[in-house]
């Protein structure tokens, strides 16, 4: 055998963030020489599941008919060819929403904001949580985590944006979570539409301020600015 077998590709359909009770299919794609596919879940000592390849043998399907807490977690897959086992795939993080009641998302001072001004998105939960996530629809990297320091639980998190530009406009939702499993999220908040008015020729903000522009604003995570004085949360990326 000349070198290790190439690693397979692992993905989930319809996506990797699944509501409680919904179905999800995990796919592992290897090569045409594959004889067996294996799915491993982090912290599970035995192979989580194994399947024969589907014709023409280059991939396998692992079905989850109804999403529950037990399925949330980090997965890798492998395939076995006549010369042995492949390298592991890159991990797939399967996240379940609906584990907790939905938080409330609001904009301060208003969801109508003039370009160049500041706005803070406030995510509030009824019960204390230690992680809050803000997502923007149709963003390539939508998850922004604010996690509390030292496990202190909070009822809210602030996501300040300054200066606001046209790229900040759009539909946002937030989730809350407990630190013991960031694969389990609350129901999503009701959507909040952030409307940015003003000049269409907004200057591009500095990457150290609100939006990283290396690959264009829609291809990068939305970063909060400043400190988070009232929440006790720190910015944290998964």
């Amino acid at each position: 055998q000349a070198g290790p077998l190439p690693k397979p590709t692992l993905w989930a359909e319809p996506g990797s963030v699944i509501s409680w009770g919904n179905s999800v299919t995990i796919w592992c794609q290897g090569t045409l020489e594959a004889r067996e596919y294996r799915l491993d879940k982090e912290e599970s000592p035995a192979p989580w599941d194994r399947q024969n390849p589907l014709e023409p043998k280059n991939k396998a399907r692992f079905s989850i008919p109804s999403m529950t807490e037990d399925y949330a977690g980090r997965y890798r897959c492998y395939y076995r060819s006549p010369v042995g086992w492949s390298q592991p795939s890159d991990p797939l993080e399967l996240v379940m929403t609906g584990a907790y009641s939905k938080p409330t998302l609001s904009a301060l001072p208003s969801p109508l904001v003039t370009s160049g001004k500041s706005v803070t998105l406030l995510c509030q939960s009824r019960s204390p949580m230690d992680t809050f996530l803000l997502i923007k629809e149709r963003a390539a990297h939508p998850l922004l985590h604010l996690r509390s320091e030292h496990g202190a639980q909070q009822h809210q998190a602030e996501f300040p944006m300054s200066p606001v530009t046209s790229v900040h406009g759009g539909t946002y939702r937030c989730f809350s979570s407990h630190g013991f499993s960031h694969y389990l999220l609350s129901h999503p908040s009701d959507p909040l539409e952030l409307i940015v008015s003003g000049s269409l020729e907004d200057p591009r903000p500095s990457p150290t301020r609100s939006v990283s522009t290396a690959a264009g604003p829609e291809d990068q995570p939305l970063m909060p600015t400043g400190s988070v004085p009232h929440s006790g949360l720190r910015r944290h990326w998964e």
């Epitope: 599970s44 192979p47 042995g84």
Partner: antibody, heavy 124, light 107 residues
């Protein structure tokens, strides 16, 4: 030491169901898949299916997919095999068997320990 | 499903004899071949896995070899306690399938 102790012999009428149990000890039950295999009188071994006790995932032989149901009770480290719509051809010794990784190199998996077997007789 | 053809179906040999059993798969099984011993009382034991690897606690007189579709199991010096039926089993693809068995008796 690893032990798989199965329930006692059963006599069933055609059309009935049977549920065979397999109590595991001497290892961590959820770390190994459990297989079920049967052997009709004077015949070879026939694989029924497998179950992962840690998550309940199952794979079945197509031949038994509609009639066999594999389950586990992790609180008692017990695996179960239920076979429905019994017919005389199902008269056999049913075995549970532990499946897991052998050796140091990843990828060598085999059934390494077997239960003593449970005779199921289907007769009118 | 992969069909495993085992031969002979039975054999009789003297204590100390070399005994050989063969197993042929209907397609290449890439060495994923195990051998089991079933004693007259019904107890089943794994002897060899992945064609040639001896399971822990199994005497070294048992050995295995082969590749592709053709595999061999050997008892180098038959002992009285080896009276049993021996099965091959492929683990290359689901479902696992077994050979028909070889019953070994002492002359």
């Amino acid at each position: 030491q690893v032990q798989l102790v199965q329930s006692g012999a059963e006599v069933k009428k055609p059309g009935a169901s049977v549920k065979v149990s397999c109590k595991a000890s001497g290892y961590t039950f959820t770390n190994y898949w459990m297989h079920w295999v049967r052997q009709a009188p004077g015949q070879g071994l026939e694989w029924i299916g497998e179950i992962n006790p840690s998550n309940g995932r199952t794979n079945y032989n197509e031949k038994f997919k509609t009639r066999a149901t594999l389950t586990v009770d992790t609180s008692t480290s017990t695996a179960y095999m239920e076979l429905s719509s019994l017919r005389s051809e199902d008269t056999a010794v049913y075995y549970c068997a532990r499946w897991g990784q052998l050796g140091l190199r990843e990828g060598y998996y085999a059934v390494d320990y077997w239960g003593q077997g449970t005779l199921v007789t289907v007769s009118s | 499903d992969i069909v495993m053809t085992q031969s002979p179906s039975s054999l009789s040999a003297s204590v100390g004899d070399r005994v050989t059993i063969t197993c042929r798969a209907s397609q290449d099984i890439s060495n994923y071949l195990n051998w089991y011993q079933q004693k007259p009382g019904g107890a089943v034991k794994l002897l060899i896995y992945y064609t040639s690897r001896l399971h822990s606690g199994v005497p070294s007189r048992f050995s295995g070899s082969g590749s592709g579709t053709d595999y061999t199991f050997t008892i180098s010096s038959l002992q009285p306690e080896d009276i049993a039926t021996y099965f091959c089993q492929q683990g290359n693809t689901l479902p696992p399938t077994f050979g028909g068995g070889t019953k070994v008796e002492i002359k």
